[in-house]
């Protein structure tokens, strides 16, 4: 384990012509903050992919208001380091993304408005425990100067923070199988530290941070017993989740749950809800005390000191049931946006997005017009996952590639003749009719049935109808 540290030295206009406009103004003062995202290896991943090594957000910088007429200076920065703790080994090679964000401090409804000002990315090799490395990155007309390093947190040492050292218990030698810790000869290598919570009885590790299970146990922390109960008249191939399939047309037929447990069907098989005092896949394990660890998902066991007294599981938030075995319905909070369908998978929430939307919470409205060109001066109009072109006069079709015939719809009334024109169409009216579309009859006495004159025009004034 250790910490990646990032120190921002300056953020301001880069060298060369075309200095950027100040991100803040007298009308809209703002302040900066930074976000760093780290990924292991030299991957060229998208900015949106998870920051597998970790991420951090800086404090907000001082409020900045532009001085009119002055060139954009280096902008005031937040105090302190950005620190990204890493729990496992430092990979040695890593990719970084550093984003500069602007927080506008106007009177926005619903809190301050954030916008991304600049994003820089890079791939570097770095040994833990080494000196600060300096770097300059440019994003458009902006320049970011920063330093970074990785350091191990005791008792970890080494270029990858994988060797663990502790002070010697005896002055002369280290314990059995443990070597001195070079260059700290007065310290000894310590035994491996498995993943936090890994069962000391049923789990072990060969690398720091892992948890491998002994036979008969499963789960991320090796705390879940693998069911050994036999299958009755198996109906099909054995299931990886339960070890067997239940006979009959439905998984709950004949109630496979023992000791008064109630059965409910799941997409793959069935699930037993056990009465207090029993647990296991089919509620087959009884005489349970708190020493048996009957409370799942971090539940706290109270009472049940001997097999005859009942225990009670106090469940952590997010879990319920007599053994804290059930999750609360988190989808009722409707976290998915834009009409996405929420799925609670247990380990995570997932959103199934409607067409035209994407992202973990369907928060991204897909740019339907991206890469779609409308020909002949047409403009692209987005809408619900599809795009259409609004074509310039004289063109039609999906992409405005077809030359439209403005006369095709026979727009001239009362037998008028239509002529296509570069600016649209012109109607030559039959005798006795007038108007842009020959829609008005001319009365025999010379008066026309024109609409009433708009306000400000006297009936005798000339009017244009196009």
């Amino acid at each position: 384990a250790g910490v990646f540290e990032l120190q921002i030295h300056s953020f301001g206009p880069g060298p060369g012509p075309g200095a950027p406009r100040s991100p803040c103004s007298a009308r809209l003062p703002c302040r900066l903050f930074f976000r760093v995202c780290l990924k292991p290896g030299l991957s060229e991943e998208a900015a949106e992919s998870p920051c597998a090594l970790g991420a951090a957000l800086s404090a907000r910088g001082p409020v900045y208001t532009e001085q009119p007429g002055a060139p954009a200076p280096d902008l005031p920065l937040p105090d302190g380091l950005l620190q990204v703790p890493f729990r496992d080994a430092w990979p040695g090679t890593f990719s970084f993304i550093i984003e500069t964000w602007r927080e506008e401090l106007g009177d926005q409804i619903g809190g301050p408005a954030w916008s991304l000002l600049a994003r820089v990315a890079g791939r570097r090799r770095l040994a833990a425990g080494g000196p600060w490395a300096r770097d300059i990155q440019r994003a458009g007309a902006w320049e970011l100067r920063f330093s970074y390093r990785a350091r191990c947190e005791p008792p970890a040492v080494g270029t990858a923070c994988t060797r663990l050292c502790r002070p010697r218990s005896a002055p002369s030698r280290c314990g059995p199988g443990l070597r001195p810790c070079a260059p700290l000869e007065d310290e000894c290598e310590a035994p491996l530290v498995c993943r936090a919570g890994c069962s000391p009885e049923h789990g072990f590790c060969e690398q720091p941070g892992e948890c491998r299970c002994l036979e008969g146990w499963t789960g991320p922390l090796c705390t879940v017993p693998v069911s050994t109960s036999s299958c009755l008249s198996p109906r099909g191939p054995s299931s990886a989740t339960t070890g067997c399939l239940v006979p009959g047309p439905g998984p709950c037929d004949g109630n496979p749950c023992a000791n008064g447990g109630s059965c409910s069907e799941t997409p793959r098989s069935f699930e037993c809800t056990c009465p207090r005092g029993f647990y296991g896949l089919r509620c087959e394990v009884s005489g349970v005390t708190c020493a048996d660890g009957p409370c799942f998902n971090g539940g706290l066991c109270v009472g049940g000191a001997d097999p005859d007294s009942a225990y009670i599981c106090h469940c952590p938030p997010g879990f319920q049931g007599s053994n804290c075995e059930k999750r609360v319905d988190r989808c009722s909070l409707q976290p998915c946006r834009n009409g996405g369908l929420c799925l609670d998978l247990g380990h995570a929430l997932r959103c199934r997005c409607r067409a035209g939307f994407a992202g973990p919470r369907c928060e991204h409205d897909l740019d339907d017009c991206a890469g779609r060109a409308c020909a002949n001066g047409g403009t692209c109009v987005e809408g619900g996952g599809a795009h259409r072109c609004s074509c310039a006069l004289g063109f039609g079709g999906r992409d405005c590639r077809e030359r439209a015939d403005p006369c095709a719809a026979r727009p001239c009334a009362h037998g008028g003749r239509c002529y296509a024109h570069f600016s649209g169409l012109v109607c030559a009216c039959a005798p006795g009719y007038m108007g842009a579309r020959c829609e008005f009859p001319v009365h025999p006495d010379g008066a026309s049935a024109l609409p009433a004159a708009p306000p400000g025009l006297r009936p005798g004034d000339p009017q244009r109808y196009l």
């Epitope: 976000r35 920051c51 991420a55 988190r330 998915c336 996405g340 973990p360 919470r361």
Partner: nanobody, 120 residues
Framework: EVQLVESGGGEVQPGGSLRLSCAAS????????MGWYRQAPGKQRELVAG???????KYAESVKGRFTISRDNAKNTVYLQMSSLRAEDTAVYYC??????????????WGQGTLVTVKP
Amino acid sequence: EVQLVESGGGEVQPGGSLRLSCAASGSIFSINAMGWYRQAPGKQRELVAGFTGDGSTKYAESVKGRFTISRDNAKNTVYLQMSSLRAEDTAVYYCAADVQLLNSDYEFYWGQGTLVTVKP
């Protein structure tokens, strides 16, 4: 890591009022959805009121017109104003939040809960 800290629970008489608050802190980039659940003894946990991912408010039928949820975005805090309280509102009230973390992942978090007791 993200923490949700609830406060404002307590004992009140029927018809009385309480205001719960829940403050989120930690590695938060943005809060997508946030609200209040409750769990009465021997009952399933249920949503009381919340701000959904789309920003709209949602209330359980049993509290409509009596409870009001509000928020202070700058403080990453939600409030539940409970009035005309009834005995059946007695429960542990949990704050819940669907949070976008600094690493762009989304995670769902729960507070530790605050007890609301309504009795004459």
